[in-house]
């Protein structure tokens, strides 16, 4: 999947299986990623597990779990708030669009989480205060988390180079560059560009991610995934000057 | 292995509450040098772990991207404290503790928010 970190780094990761997105004293988020096509290096998120830890007079421990084709509007115990404590309403789930869009507000830690199902796969977005991000007591045993440090280099796909290589070529010519089995031949680069431009007129990294996803999968739903990811940034990012991220000139090989 | 502490301190120094070190300022390079120093210190106990190698490569990448020299000043991280998680000994009847912004305003300016997102393939 594509990852935008807390430090506004933008990466495309081929991480497979369960990886922690966030792991601090208040919250644990784990994403499970699966290959989009058999044998593909590119992966997308098929499951999200969010654990809100027990917090003072506010909330009991609550677990939210979303999977492909199952985006519940409740925690796994069936509740929609933080339990029986005095401040239980400081944790709330709201269903925005049935089966497609859920928002979780954790006011006690100033955090908003948006989970969507777009096509077969899930998207995740979070707005969180810096000090909550940094609230890690035991650096030894609390895990590595992608939202803070990004994906390991050996788990990154240089999709910007892929995008450059792809210009002016049809899907057949992409076979060598593609990290996945080639997309259907009926899906040339020009079509991918047109579909992405429609939804993402600014040629930023979200637009490039969209083109990459269409060329590697042939699945138009990924256009919406990039579109909604950018919409979530607009809603959640505190720095309105950093909504769009652009390709940086790279001194190192990808 | 304390490499995650290095990561967090770098993040804190470059995303601080008032004027964060923007990407192309001397402050950013100073924060990077601090990050590099921190990782060097942890090398003995972290050298076999993924987080250490990710940090080392990430620093090299960022140093190169931002034309930072290896020598020069370093920066100190900014840190604040949040109430302890879990069942605290100091229980409060006030619901204010369950509203982050209200309780935050008591000891600081507006909280500095940050964003993370995961989507597509």
């Amino acid at each position: 999947p594509h990852l935008r970190t807390f430090t506004d780094r933008f990466q495309t990761c081929k991480v497979q299986g369960a990886w922690p997105l966030i792991d601090n004293n208040y919250l644990n988020v784990q994403a499970t990623n699966t290959p989009v096509l058999p044998g593909s290096a590119a992966t997308a998120t098929s499951k999200l597990t969010i654990i809100f830890k027990n917090f003072q007079e506010c909330v009991d421990q609550k677990v939210y779990q979303a999977e492909m084709d199952e985006l519940p509007a409740a925690f796994v115990d069936g509740s929609k708030n933080g339990g029986d404590k005095h401040g239980a309403n400081s944790l709330k789930i709201t269903e925005k669009v049935s089966g497609q869009h859920v928002e979780i507000q954790a006011k006690y830690i100033g955090t908003t989480i948006v989970v969507r199902q777009v096509g077969r796969y899930l998207t995740f977005a979070v707005r969180m205060p810096e000090e909550v991000v940094n609230a890690v007591e035991d650096w030894d045993s609390q895990g590595l988390y992608l939202c803070l440090r990004g994906c390991p280099l050996n788990q990154q796909i240089d999709f910007q180079a892929f995008h450059t290589n792809a210009e002016g070529t049809g899907a057949r010519r992409l076979a060598a560059a593609s990290p996945a089995p080639t997309a259907p031949e009926t899906f040339p680069y020009e079509t991918a560009v047109a579909k992405c431009k429609e939804k993402l007129p600014v040629e930023d990294l979200y637009y490039q991610a969209c083109v990459f996803d269409l060329l590697t999968t042939g699945d138009v739903n990924f256009t919406l995934a990039a579109y909604y990811a950018l919409e979530d940034v607009k809603m959640l990012h505190s720095n309105k000057d950093k909504l769009h991220l652009y390709e940086r000139t790279r001194d190192l090989p990808g | 292995c304390k490499i995650l502490k290095c990561n967090s301190e770098f993040w804190s120094a470059t995303s601080g509450s008032h004027a964060p070190a923007s990407d192309d300022t001397p402050e950013f390079c100073a924060a990077l040098r601090s990050y590099a120093l921190c990782t060097r210190r942890t090398a003995r106990t972290c050298r076999g772990d993924l987080a250490y190698h990710s940090a080392v490569h990430g620093i090299e990448d960022l140093m190169s991207q931002h034309n930072c020299s290896k020598d020069g000043p370093t920066s100190q991280p900014r840190l604040r404290t949040l109430p302890p998680a879990g069942d605290s000994q100091e229980r409060s009847d006030s619901p204010e503790i369950c509203h982050y912004e209200k309780s935050f305003h008591k000891h600081s300016a507006t909280p500095n928010y940050t964003h993370c997102g995961l989507f597509g393939d």
Epitope: L144 | G48, D49
Partner: antibody, heavy 115, light 112 residues
């Protein structure tokens, strides 16, 4: 909860070989360096060696260099210790431990080298 | 190789009393800018070792605060402020500053 379970120990003749396994759970195995440490009966602890998270580097104690090989299979969350040319002095409980420096240890598996 | 020498090798203590174990290194364990990778492990009878202290004085997660570590350079100490029955076992110092990693020979703590 971090769990490490060693297996593969037993009785072997001098000069023989044995492969120990360490099954890991409760943490992201592929993120961490791993160690093997042993303890002869009634004796202290001896570090055998360690392997990086991606197997890119391995370090060994002089006493086992050239005879023992550490490997790992991250897809199976398993660490291995291949022991060749075994000697009587290799008789010990063998522990695997998580981290570049060992923080969590398994319960150990006994290796007896005797004719 | 770095040799770690512990003393005493046997330490009989009365319950509730303090205990102190010394670990002396054959060379300085300071690695860089004050970082010293000296650790302490506890091995209860019939169990595997458990990490107590790392970097001379930092308690590992779940370790009671009656355990404390101190020292620098080549001389290090593990202190137990009030010994409890569950503290019986062998205590090892361990260094990760130099390759190969080495352990002390162990100090057996028993109740008087």
């Amino acid at each position: 909860e971090v769990q490490l379970v060693e297996s593969g120990g037993g009785l072997v003749q001098p000069g023989g070989s044995l492969r120990l396994s360490c099954a890991a759970s409760g943490f992201t195995f592929s993120n961490y360096g791993m160690n093997w440490i042993r303890q002869a009966p009634g004796k202290g602890l001896e570090w055998i060696g360690m392997i990086y998270y991606d197997s890119s580097e391995k370090h060994y104690a002089d006493s086992v260099k050239g005879r023992f090989t550490i490997s790992r299979d991250n897809s199976k969350n398993t660490l291995y210790l291949q022991m060749n040319s075994l000697r009587a002095e290799d008789t010990a409980v063998y522990y695997c431990a998580k981290g570049t420096t060992p923080d969590y240890w398994g319960q150990g598996t006994m290796v007896t080298v005797s004719s | 190789d770095v040799v770690l020498t512990q003393s005493p090798l046997s330490l009989p203590v009365t319950l509730g009393q303090p205990a102190s174990i010394s670990c002396r290194s054959s060379q300085s364990l300071e690695y860089s800018d004050g970082y010293t990778f000296l650790e302490w492990f506890q091995q209860r009878p019939g169990q595997s070792p458990r990490r107590l202290i790392y970097e001379v004085s930092n308690r590992f997660s779940g370790v009671p605060d009656r355990f404390s570590g101190s020292g620098s350079g080549t001389d290090f100490t593990l202190k137990i402020s009030r010994v409890e029955a569950e503290d019986v076992g062998v205590y090892y110092c361990f260094q990760a500053t130099h390759d190969p990693l080495t352990f002390g020979q162990g100090t057996k703590l028993e109740i008087k």
